[in-house]
């Protein structure tokens, strides 16, 4: 036997003024039907029947996946990062082929000293995580390395990381200008060739909550938007209450359609409500029925 699908109706009036009954299952829309055991379900909009209920795809929900959610979960990363590819020339160490071998004593000691030196140079940058040597080559020692930066995600993360990369440039330029060999002597942990300092490339984490929101909203992308609360982005439709963009339907219910958010106005025992925001009330005339 096929399971009966309960269809409840609510007396609602669209903002155009006509009274409509909105079934929880829209029979007029073609649906895919899957039969599992003796259960039958109509799951719309790509949803599938799991044996008990419809499993809906974002942004849909409801008994038959016929309704559009008011908000979509978007999850920005906890932290965002930047990677700067830099080159500096160290003059206080003689280049040997052993430096190319990352498991050699020469490389390990050079790496330790270079890392210590860079930790000192960048000590005042809160976003600084560390350095990673990618290649060492002749000349005295040309050090190709990455400077790693990280910060907590906030809407302004790009500005924070951009500022940090600028400070990195300033600090590496300063140290490689000041810590130089004089009279064949280097009195610092490491000495540099001023002209060998170059920033090759900067890569910053790309995260756009608006883009994620639009992608997840699919065909409703034009009607979902991102609003922030406590520096956290929320992907909402105008039907979600409590935000700047929230639609106030007064005496009605907000519903998403492919043309955007609209208000379905209620009819009470005493009033009809109409208007785009269901804020125009018309009192019903009272008829006396005699038995």
């Amino acid at each position: 036997p096929l399971a009966t699908i309960p269809v409840s109706t609510t007396s609602l009036t669209s903002s155009e003024g006509s009274t409509i009954s909105t079934p929880s299952v829209d029979i007029s829309t073609p649906v895919t039907t899957s039969i599992v055991g003796d259960q039958c379900s109509r799951c719309k909009n790509g949803g599938f029947w799991d044996g008990l209920k419809c499993q809906c795809l974002t942004p849909y929900y409801g008994e038959s996946c016929e309704e559009v959610v008011n908000s979509i979960d978007i999850a920005p990363p906890e932290t965002v990062s930047a990677q700067m590819e830099l080159t500096v020339t160290v003059t206080s160490v003689k280049f040997t082929d052993e430096l190319k071998n990352h498991s050699s004593q020469e490389f390990r000691e050079f790496n330790k000293t270079f890392t210590e030196q860079m930790n000192i140079v960048y000590s005042g940058i809160p976003e600084y995580v560390g350095v990673n040597i990618t290649n060492l080559r002749l000349g005295s020692v040309v050090v190709e390395h990455d400077v790693l930066l990280r910060t907590k995600y906030t809407p302004e993360y790009k500005t924070a990381l951009d500022n940090a990369t600028e400070v990195v440039k300033q600090k590496i330029t300063k140290v490689t200008t000041e810590q130089i060999m004089t009279n064949d002597n280097c009195s610092a942990l490491m000495c540099f060739n001023t002209t060998g300092t170059q920033v090759q490339n900067i890569t910053v984490t790309q995260y756009d909550p608006v883009e994620e929101c639009r992608q997840k909203a699919e065909e409703y992308e034009d009607y979902f938007l991102v609003e922030y609360r406590d520096q956290k982005p929320y992907c909402i439709s105008p039907c979600e209450s409590g935000f700047n963009a929230s639609k106030n339907c007064n005496h009605g219910k907000c519903q998403m359609s492919q043309n955007g958010a609209r208000c379905l106005c209620v009819t009470t025992e005493t009033h009809w409500y109409s208007g785009e925001d269901c804020n125009q009330g018309t009192q019903k005339s009272h008829h006396h029925h005699h038995h």
């Epitope: 280049f95 020469e106 050079f110 280097c186 009195s187």
Partner: nanobody, 124 residues
Framework: EVQLVESGGGLVQPGRSLRLSCAAS???????MGWFRQAPGKEREGVAG???????GYADSVKGRFTISKDNAKNSLYLQMNSLRAEDTALYSC???????????????????RGQGTQVTVSS
């Protein structure tokens, strides 16, 4: 990691001599080596240094009295201290640079390996 172990310290009378030794666990041929000292309540100071190519440097206070040398074959560093004075009393430690370090002709250089030290007390 390079391990450095100092020896030769002790109690000595003013005007006498002492020879400090520093045994390294690895090759010191391609390293700058140095001796440092720290007296109670004072900052650590460079005493003497020797570069990879044998060039030496000394603190003004010890010039003409102390001599630094190294024996690459034995991976050892030495500090010959003559005409010792009461103000030479300190904990003496040896230090080594990273491999292939060049340009360490002054004593302000920061070495990356350092021993525990040996105590020298000059007193009558």
């Amino acid at each position: 990691e390079v391990q450095l172990v100092e020896s030769g310290g002790g109690l000595v009378q003013p005007g006498r001599s002492l020879r400090l030794s520093c045994a390294a666990s690895g090759d010191i041929t391609r390293r700058c080596m140095g001796w440092f000292r720290q007296a109670p309540g004072k900052e650590r100071e460079g005493v003497a240094g020797i570069s990879e190519d044998g060039i030496t440097g000394y603190a003004d206070s010890v010039k003409g009295r102390f001599t630094i040398s190294k024996d690459n074959a034995k991976n050892s560093l030495y500090l010959q201290m003559n005409s010792l004075r009461a103000e030479d009393t300190a904990l003496y430690s040896c230090a080594a640079s990273i491999l292939n370090r060049v340009g360490c002709r002054q004593l302000s250089y920061e070495y990356i390996y350092r021993g525990q030290g040996t105590q020298v007390t000059v007193s009558s």
